[in-house]
Interface confidence: low
């Protein structure tokens, strides 16, 4: 997605993005909270497509691993957190049933705040 | 995805999430920057599946539309921005070729900073 640094902007939280294959992923959590196996390939009209996902998470090596950038530290504690979204994937559940389910994948790194209590 | 408010946390940027059908979406931008038509249904072994997407964007009505929450305003200007990610969708391009392509969808609302220059 578009890079804030190109516009002379900084992110409050540093993130990293990568393409993740089903082979790397192996399992995921579906919308009902169950663990499902992510199938490596999806049958399509002309054969098979490798199943993979674009994932974004907080950068564990980044400057912001200790807290978010630019926060008013007098009033707030902050933390960068990876958030998830749902994408449809071809999966097999624990009941050995194959089907398309929405699974959770990492899609962003956002900043969460907790108010500082009077010392 | 997990709700920070449940843990007594606030988001630096307020977001809204919704399920968007292909019928609502109609078109999208693929990875090469081209506009494609998003097909309403996907053929699967037992018939057809409605194609839809879980999208998250900045809340235009939220408190944070004027800037991010909790920022040190002495040093930074801030803005909440919708960021995008890629998901695979069955699409048709301008040459009427149908195929699975990665398209951009809104997946998060993050805070970007620009440093305040000396007044």
């Amino acid at each position: 997605h578009s890079d804030p640094a190109r516009r002379g902007e900084l992110s409050v939280c540093d993130s990293i993005s990568e393409w993740v294959t089903a082979a790397d992923k192996k399992t995921a959590v579906d919308m009902s909270g169950g663990t499902v196996t992510v199938l490596e390939k999806v049958p399509v009209s002309k054969g098979q497509l490798k199943q993979y996902f674009y994932e974004t998470k907080c950068n564990p090596m980044g400057y912001t691993k200790e807290g978010c950038r630019g926060i008013d530290k007098r009033h707030w504690n902050s933390q960068c957190r990876t958030t998830q979204s749902y994408v449809r994937a071809l999966t097999m559940d624990s009941k050995k049933r194959i089907g398309w389910r929405f699974i959770r994948i990492d899609t962003s790194c956002v900043c969460t705040l907790t108010i500082k209590r009077g010392r | 995805h997990s709700d920070p408010a449940r843990r007594g946390e606030l988001s630096v940027c307020d977001s809204i999430s919704e399920w968007v059908t292909a019928a609502d979406k109609k078109t999208a931008v693929d990875m090469s920057g081209g506009t494609v038509t998003v097909l309403e249904k996907v053929p699967v072994s037992k018939g057809q599946l409605k194609q839809y997407f879980y999208e998250t964007k900045c809340n235009p009505m939220g408190y944070t539309k004027e800037g991010c929450r909790g920022i040190d305003k002495r040093h930074w200007n801030s803005q909440c921005r919708t960021t995008q990610s890629y998901v695979r969708a069955l699409t048709m391009d301008s040459k009427k070729r149908i195929g699975w392509r990665f398209i951009r969808i809104d997946t998060s609302c993050v805070c970007t900073l620009t440093i305040k220059r000396g007044r």
């Epitope: 579906d30 009902s32 169950g34 999966t91 559940d93 624990s94 049933r97 089907g99 389910r101 929405f102 | -």
Partner: antibody
Framework: DVQLVESGGSVVRPGESLRLSCAAS????????MSWVRQAPGEGLEWVSG??????????YYADSVKDRFTVSRDNSKNTLYLQMNSLRAEDTAVYYC????????????WGLGTLVTVSS | EIVLTQSPGTLGLSPGERATLSCRAS???????LAWYQQKPGQAPRLLIY???TRAAGIPARFSGSGSGTEFTLTISSLQSEDFAVYYC????????FGGGTKVEIK
Amino acid sequence: DVQLVESGGSVVRPGESLRLSCAASGFTFSIYDMSWVRQAPGEGLEWVSGIRGSGGDAVTYYADSVKDRFTVSRDNSKNTLYLQMNSLRAEDTAVYYCAKENNRRIFFDYWGLGTLVTVSS
Amino acid sequence: EIVLTQSPGTLGLSPGERATLSCRASRSIGRTYLAWYQQKPGQAPRLLIYDTSTRAAGIPARFSGSGSGTEFTLTISSLQSEDFAVYYCQQYDDWPSFGGGTKVEIK
């Protein structure tokens, strides 16, 4: 409290059809897999059919004994599970239970009281 | 299909006695995918035990399950009057199937 209430059972002739309903309450019906299990008079339990919840799309499964004759469906907006039974046979005579599947595997953590289907000429 | 055979068919015991119910599978059941249910006349079955030995919510500690492979056991350590019922085992390693049941009756 979880409640499952079956209805629609009656006496029918062989070859006829019947539709059973199961009204669910006390849990988020739409996300859970559901099943029908039957019990012939004086006999044990037999799993009949299952349908997946909204973690996936509503894919259906059947025991070999009812495949191509029975159809399971659900209406999440009404919190209701259905079993459409066609070409009924004498051996389909049983109490039919609606059961909520555990979210991990196919065992049943809640059951209804059942509805009796009698197939007799 | 996995066939489950329960024994004995009927078990006559007195309140306070220990009940041991057996469930044998026609082939080995993967992991611990076996459940036990209790059914009283005119009532729906009630889940007692799942994953061979885990008690379901609200089930008293006198009920316990054990076993692996093809041999599984439900034990009621000290029978109470409300425990006299029919008990079914069910495997869920494959498409679900039930045993024929064991009736626990007052001697």
